[in-house]
Interface confidence: medium
């Protein structure tokens, strides 16, 4: 197979440490202009499976503030604006990367961590278990 | 005042370069047991705003594979299983952190990047603009 040549301008890394620890540039390239989930859309209010956004805050993590969706109802909102319990509001989850300081109190040493967050809710047909 | 002492095991940093670059340990602490979005739930099929999951792959990014949701319909699925265009299927988006190799093809040098991904879809009441 074809191997992409290693860029000669790469920082050095000793095999014994690679790839456990890498250098990361903090000049974050942000492809998005709006980072506030409440501003980005009002889907959380207009959805047939509406949700509330709760602030999950941890000063020892980056990002320190993560918004977690909690579905407002067990059922879904029908055309009359009432909750229909024949349908279910369920959270849509996403696994995201965060950075946590490690070892503690080191200003420039971090570990990647994966956490599961609920981003919003969707309305699904329930799985019905029929008893014989 | 009292300063938290700097951990003696911290990586060194020269003031002129610090804090643009930090060390990140890639031994990811994963708080989740299930990482495959197709396995984690079948909501994408059971939703009234169903979606398909598309594989977005980039070897110069970590994680190299990200699953992107694309809503199947403009409308939502009604109780009869038909698409109701009086409602809208819309993507729920989440801003996530990724690592991008920089310079390209360097195995241990990255830049933090924020990208917006569609995680799933939800069914919303449309905003109707009335013409006078």
């Amino acid at each position: 197979g074809i191997t992409i040549p290693r860029n000669p301008g790469c920082p050095n890394s000793e095999d014994k440490n690679f790839p456990r620890t890498v250098m990361v540039n903090l000049n974050i390239h942000n492809r998005n202009t709006n980072t506030n989930p409440k501003r980005s859309s009002d889907y959380y209010n207009r959805s047939t499976s509406p949700w509330n956004l709760h602030r999950n805050e941890d000063p020892e993590r980056y990002p320190s503030v993560i918004w977690e969706a909690k579905c407002r109802h067990l059922g879904c909102i029908n055309a009359d604006g009432n909750v229909d319990y024949h349908m279910n509001s369920v959270p849509i989850q996403q696994e995201i990367l965060v950075l946590r300081r490690e070892p503690p109190h080191c200003p420039n040493s971090f570990r990647l961590e994966k956490i599961l967050v609920s981003v919003g809710c969707t309305c699904v047909t329930p799985i019905v278990h029929h008893v014989a | 005042g009292i300063t938290i002492p700097r951990n003696p095991g911290c990586p060194n940093s020269e003031d002129k370069n610090f804090p643009r670059t930090v060390m990140v340990n890639l031994n990811i602490h994963n708080r989740n047991t299930n990482t495959n979005p197709k396995r984690s739930s079948d909501y994408y099929n059971r939703s009234t705003s169903p979606w398909n999951l598309h594989r977005n792959e980039d070897p110069e990014r970590y994680p190299s594979v990200i699953w992107e949701a694309k809503c199947r319909h403009l409308g939502c699925i009604n109780a009869d299983g038909n698409v109701d265009y009086h409602m809208n299927s819309v993507p729920i988006q989440q801003e996530i952190l990724v690592l991008r190799r920089e310079p390209p093809h360097c195995p241990n040098s990255f830049r933090l990047e924020k990208i917006l991904v569609s995680v799933g879809c939800t069914c919303v009441t449309p905003i109707v603009h009335h013409v006078a």
Epitope: P59, Y62, S64, V65, L99, N108 | -
Partner: nanobody, 119 residues
Framework: EVQLVESGGGLVQPGGSLRLSCAAS????????MYWVRQAPGKGLEWVAE????????YYVSDVKGRFTISRDNAKNSLYLQMNSLRAEDTAVYYC????????????WGQGTLVTVSS
């Protein structure tokens, strides 16, 4: 939603003083380091001062040390910058910023307050 609102800027003569304030909301103010950063006309952003969550530790960029004092009131969710012996080169838009564990990386800024030092 995280909000930072600065005030207190204005026109001042060289050698004069100003006190900038920043009102914070939408996060647990007392848990985070806070910063003042500035942008002089036609220049890039420059870090000015940092204060740790308890207020007991402060850091300053070398050219403001001894002239500027950063402080905070966690009960009022407020950050301050006392600026004395102001110089023409201190002319800039001053922003307060919420700290993150990533050193000198800010996700949230205020809208800024303009400080003009001129005779």
């Amino acid at each position: 939603e995280v909000q930072l609102v600065e005030s207190g800027g204005g026109l001042v003569q060289p050698g004069g003083s100003l006190r900038l304030s920043c009102a914070a909301s939408g996060f647990t103010f007392s848990s985070y380091s806070m910063y003042w950063v500035r942008q002089a006309p036609g220049k890039g952003l420059e870090w000015v001062a940092e204060i740790k969550p308890t207020g007991s530790v402060q850091y300053y960029v070398s050219d403001v040390k001894g002239r500027f004092t950063i402080s905070r009131d966690n009960a009022k969710n407020s950050l301050y910058l006392q600026m004395n012996s102001l110089r023409a080169e201190d002319t800039a838009v001053y922003y307060c910023a919420k700290g993150e564990i990533l050193p000198l990386y800010f996700d949230y800024w205020g809208q800024g307050t303009l400080v003009t030092v001129s005779s």
